[in-house]
Each structure stands twice: as C-alpha cells, then as structure tokens.
Amino acid sequence: LTCLGGFASPGPVPPSTALRELIEELVNITQNQKAPLCNGSMVWSINLTAGMYCAALESLINVSGCSAIEKTQRMLSGFCPHKVSAGQFSSLHVRDTKIEVAQFVKDLLLHLKKLFREGQFN
C-alpha cells in the first residue's frame, strides 16, 4: 500500500513527474478556457481522499465529446488500477452533488497542487 493524502491507497500512485504532468494539464485547461468548458456539462463531485484518481475518472468518463479533457481522462485512466466505464459509480462520489466540469477541474487542481507541495506522490 502507498500513502496518498494520509489515506491508504490501493494501486499505483502517480510519481512526481506524472503528478506534475497532470497538474500542468489541468492548469492548461483552466487557463485556456474560453466558452463554458465541455458545454457546461455537469459531473458528480468526489471525495478528494483515497482512490481519488479512480473516482475522478469515474466522474469525468461520463463526459464525452469534450476535446479539452481527453488528455486528462487518459492520464487518470493511467493512474487508476482498475477498469472504469461510463455509468460506473463508487462510494467515492458525493452522489447528491453535481458540479460543472470547470469547477471539478479547479477543485481537483487545487487538491493535486496541495499533494505536490506536501510531497505526497510516492
């Protein structure tokens, strides 16, 4: 088991270079956003704790047709040790709360930056 955010995390956790690349991609998305990101699509909010990469993928994988987040979907898929399909949900979602993809990306970015600053990527 590896440690992510103080919680036991099953499966591989991205090393520093991969985490940095994901952060850079999310920064790129937020900075280059012109029209509403992904046509204003809504996704389930997630608990930014253990298993966050799989949970984030489970939310974002239900967004199709959004070129801006395709690379993010690929990265999260690489970080998640199990197969994730559209329509799949786990207990890691805050199932009563939907937020816009733009807000989801911002929240995820802030949390990943915090993890990176704290050196929690091994």
Epitope: I61, N62, G65, M75, G78
Partner: antibody
Framework: QVQLKESGPGLVAPSQSLSITCTVS????????INWVRQPPGKGLEWLGM???????DFNSALKSRLSISKDNSKSQVFLKLNSLQTDDTARYYC????????????WGQGTSVTVSS | HIVLTQSPASLAVSLGQRATISCRAS??????????LHWYQQKPGQPPKLLIY???KLESGVPARFSGSGSRTDFTLTIDPVEADDAATYYC?????????FGGGSKLEIK
C-alpha cells in the same frame, strides 16, 4: 436508440464540391463526437475527419485543405463538405459516432454512395 | 501521421480453427498505460462493427471467441474457434496521436 443517417447527392461532377448531411437521433450532438469515414468500392476504410461535441475539429492531413466539417446541434445534423472532387473520391461515405472514452467508433450510419463522374 | 499495416491482406481458415491477424503501427499508439488501438469487423454491404477497444477489451455483445493483444506498435486480433459467421474484413484503427487512421484491412475466408 442511437441512429445516424447520411444523405448525399449520389452523383457529383469532377472539380465540383460534395456536401453530405448526417442526421442523428437518440443522443445530443453537444455531448458526442461524429466521424466521417469513406470506403472506395472494393477498398478499405479511410478516416476523413471528426467534429467533437464541443465543436472542435480534426482532419485527415491529406484532405485537410479541401475538407470542412460543421454541425447544427439544434437540428441534430452534421455536415461534410469536400471540395475539388476527383474520380478517386468515389466512395461510400459514412458518418459514425464515438463511444465514451476511449472514443472508439461505436455507432455507424449505413452510408451514402457518391460517384464522381462527368 | 501513424500508418497501420495489417497482415495478411487475406486469409483462409478452416471452421473451428484459429485465425490470427496482425496490425503494426509506424509509431507507438500507447499513451498513459493504454493502447489506443481498436478492431472492427465489416461484412459485405454493412458498416463496420466495433469488436475490441484499447487493444484487448471486448466490446459488449461480442463473443469471447474474439480476443486482442499487443502494445506499443504490434497488435494481434485472434478468433478462436472460427465460425462461418466470422467471414468478413477486419480493420484496426488508432486514435492515439494526430489524425485517426485505419489499417488496410484483412479479409477472412472460412474454408
């Protein structure tokens, strides 16, 4: 259920432009990618280009200079326009929708046959 | 752009035997641990049908006789055992980098 239907002119003269419309039902164009693929008689598949749900487009580099793809989300229609047609553009033209990530092409129309001839 | 080369261009396999089709990419189609290589089946007069995505994942409703393997630049579609209904042309397709591309196709005949 997901359906796609192409409608085209059938016959086009050389040097003219080809316009094909793909009319979809069972889903919204704002949330899914549409590809254009063609198949010359007795030959293989050639990917022409695509339009993402968010409106961005990608093209086959060999055809980029004479190809355009657009859509009208409210009418559930996607449009292909290919300029300066030659006889080797004769083919069956398909519109097809991606699935969700990883965006393999999951749903296909029946295609429309286009002949370029004078 | 990435060129996909399929081999053989045609093959004849006896009923109940194994059919193997290869797809080779001019550069890697792998990205973040996944291979963005998909397989389609096309029967005469019909549009293509998705069989396998991400190199090895079986599309819903596709018989388990079909399987895919490989990574980076070398991929294989296997049909075992072959049934009469499998007579068709099979195509690989990538969507990893740049414009999407298809392989040239492999026509399977059942003996």
């Amino acid at each position: 259920q997901v359906q796609l239907k192409e409608s085209g002119p059938g016959l086009v003269a050389p040097s003219q432009s080809l316009s094909i419309t793909c009319t979809v039902s069972g889903f919204s164009l704002t949330g899914h990618n549409i590809n254009w693929v063609r198949q010359p008689p007795g030959k293989g598949l050639e990917w022409l280009g695509m339009i993402w749900g968010d409106g961005n487009t990608d093209f086959n580099s060999a055809l980029k200079s004479r190809l355009s793809i657009s859509k009208d989300n409210s009418k559930s229609q996607v449009f292909l326009k290919l300029n300066s047609l030659q006889t080797d553009d004769t083919a069956r033209y398909y519109c097809a929708r991606d699935g969700y990530y990883p965006y393999a092409i999951k749903f296909w129309g029946q295609g429309t046959s286009v002949t370029v001839s004078s | 752009h990435i060129v996909l080369t399929q081999s053989p261009a045609s093959l004849a396999v006896s009923l109940g035997q194994r059919a193997t089709i290869s797809c080779r990419a001019s550069e890697t189609v792998d990205s973040y641990g996944s291979s963005f290589l998909h397989w389609y089946q096309q029967k005469p007069g019909q549009p293509p049908k998705l069989l396998i995505y991400l190199a090895s994942k079986l599309e819903s409703g596709v018989p388990a006789r079909f399987s895919g393997s490989g990574s980076r630049t070398d991929f294989t579609l296997t049909i075992d055992p072959v049934e009469a209904d499998d007579a068709a042309t099979y195509y690989c397709q990538q969507n990893n980098e740049g414009p999407r591309t298809f392989g040239g196709g492999s026509k399977l005949e059942i003996k």
